[in-house]
């Protein structure tokens, strides 16, 4: 005999949780449902769109001898290396008979230390010749404030108070190193150190 009385109510007994973490994090979202009769295929949605190439696995177990008895179904969606493109609202969707059921939503968010999109590059310059260096970083969380350092000495009193994405250097008379620090609410990330070699005059 069926283990649950059935009504036109969502068959979901478990909904996706929330995942918030830094880039590269691995996590699993799950949906759980108990249905009478043939178990449905579980589809995953992100921001309302079906994920065609989702890394999901579905486990289904009959709870009785008769195929019209209840089945338990667990679908697991694996996020192997969290990226900005993975963020959004996740739901499970099933078609049962002539009805569509959608789970309650879970959310995937990215939050961690700043991530560099651009870092200062090594270069060779003529003495006392102006040049620019670039540095760009993003969160979340935003805002991300930059602090430039020359030979490990900060060029501003605090992050965000000096030059940001582009540092204009009016000229150098000796080889120097430059780096930039990206600060957000989660902490600080330091870029690579660029060596600016000054050619003798």
């Amino acid at each position: 005999a069926p283990r649950g009385t059935q009504a036109e109510e969502s068959p979901f007994v478990g909904n996706p949780g929330n995942i918030t973490g830094a880039r590269g994090l691995t996590g699993t979202l799950r949906c759980q449902l108990q249905v009478q009769g043939e178990p449905p295929e579980v589809h995953w949605l992100r921001d309302g769109q079906i994920l065609e190439l989702a890394d999901s696995t579905q486990t289904q177990v009959p709870l009785g001898e008769d195929e019209q008895d209840d089945w338990i179904v667990v679908s697991q969606l694996r996020i192997t290396s969290l990226q900005l493109s993975d963020t959004g609202q996740y739901q499970c969707l099933v078609f049962l008979g002539h009805q569509t059921f959608v789970s309650q939503p879970g959310y995937v968010g990215l939050e961690g230390l700043p991530y560099f999109l651009e870092e200062p590059e090594d270069r060779t310059v003529a003495a006392n010749t102006p040049f620019n260096l670039s540095c760009q970083a993003q969160g979340p969380p935003e805002p991300v404030d930059l602090l430039w350092l020359q030979d490990a000495v900060p060029l501003a009193t605090a992050p965000g108070h000096g030059p940001q994405r582009s540092l204009h250097v009016p000229g150098l008379n000796k080889t120097s190193s430059f780096s930039c620090e990206a600060h957000n609410a989660k902490g600080v990330t330091t870029s690579r150190t660029a060596t600016i070699t000054v050619l003798p005059q």
Epitope: T5, Q6, A7, E9, V13, G14, T59, V61
Partner: antibody, heavy 120, light 107 residues
């Protein structure tokens, strides 16, 4: 703050009936599956019954099926367990528990319990 | 019916120790395992669900792990307030079933 308060327990004779209530506050009651779990004197926990948020799906332990009915009144934020044909082996502390959002078959908040003693 | 077996009725530990409480399911429950803590005179409190997801407000010294049929709850840096009964439960399917409990006590 999630709060669950059971009432309705007592001492009854075998074959009698009893109705437990659980008043919920601090959350949107209709969004959560709810369960009754009992604990016997030997400290063992035994699941009794569960009900979906809207009340349309119910699940029972085999040896209470046909004797116990789980129900809910969402407008009153109240969960019920109607128990009939009570047996001495039903003697236990009955807890009302909220199902976790990620799986309402896992219970994330429990009441303090209501004692049921079935004895001749 | 899925049987949850907690092989140790009692486990002795010392403050600051690391202890693992184990639970075995009679069939694969696809990580649908919860862990509860119960102190004398109190109702059970959820610690872990889906084998490794910590419930809100649970200290990170409590860690759940496992898959298939074998699961464990590890408490690192045991505190005196951790001395209690611990129960595993499968939340894979009805009938929902609990282990018999493990009492964590001081050596």
């Amino acid at each position: 703050e999630v709060n669950l308060v059971e009432s309705g327990g007592g001492v009854v004779k075998p074959g009698a009936s009893l109705k437990l209530s659980c008043e919920a506050s601090g959350f949107t009651f209709s969004n959560y599956g709810m369960s009754w779990v009992r604990q016997t004197s030997d400290k063992r926990l035994e699941w009794v019954a569960s009900i979906s948020g809207g009340g349309g799906r119910t699940y029972y332990l085999d040896n209470v099926k046909g004797r116990f009915i789980i129900s809910r009144e969402n407008a009153k934020n109240t969960l019920y367990l109607q128990m009939s044909s009570l047996k001495s082996e039903d003697t236990a502390l009955f807890y009302c528990a909220r199902g976790a959002r990620a799986s309402y078959f896992a219970m994330d908040y429990w009441g303090q319990g209501s004692s049921v003693t079935v004895s001749s | 019916v899925i049987v949850m077996t907690q092989s140790h009725k009692f486990m002795s530990t010392s403050v600051g120790d690391r202890v693992s409480i184990t639970c075995k399911a009679s069939q694969d429950v696809t990580t649908a395992v919860a862990w509860y803590q119960q102190k004398p005179g109190q109702s059970p409190k959820l610690l872990i669900y889906w084998a490794s997801t910590r419930h809100t407000g649970v200290p990170d010294r409590f860690t759940g792990s496992g898959s298939g049929t074998d699961y464990s709850l590890t408490i690192s840096n045991v505190q005196t307030e951790d001395l209690a009964f611990y129960y595993c439960q499968q939340h894979f399917t009805t009938p929902l079933t609990f282990g018999a409990g493990t009492k964590l006590e001081l050596k």
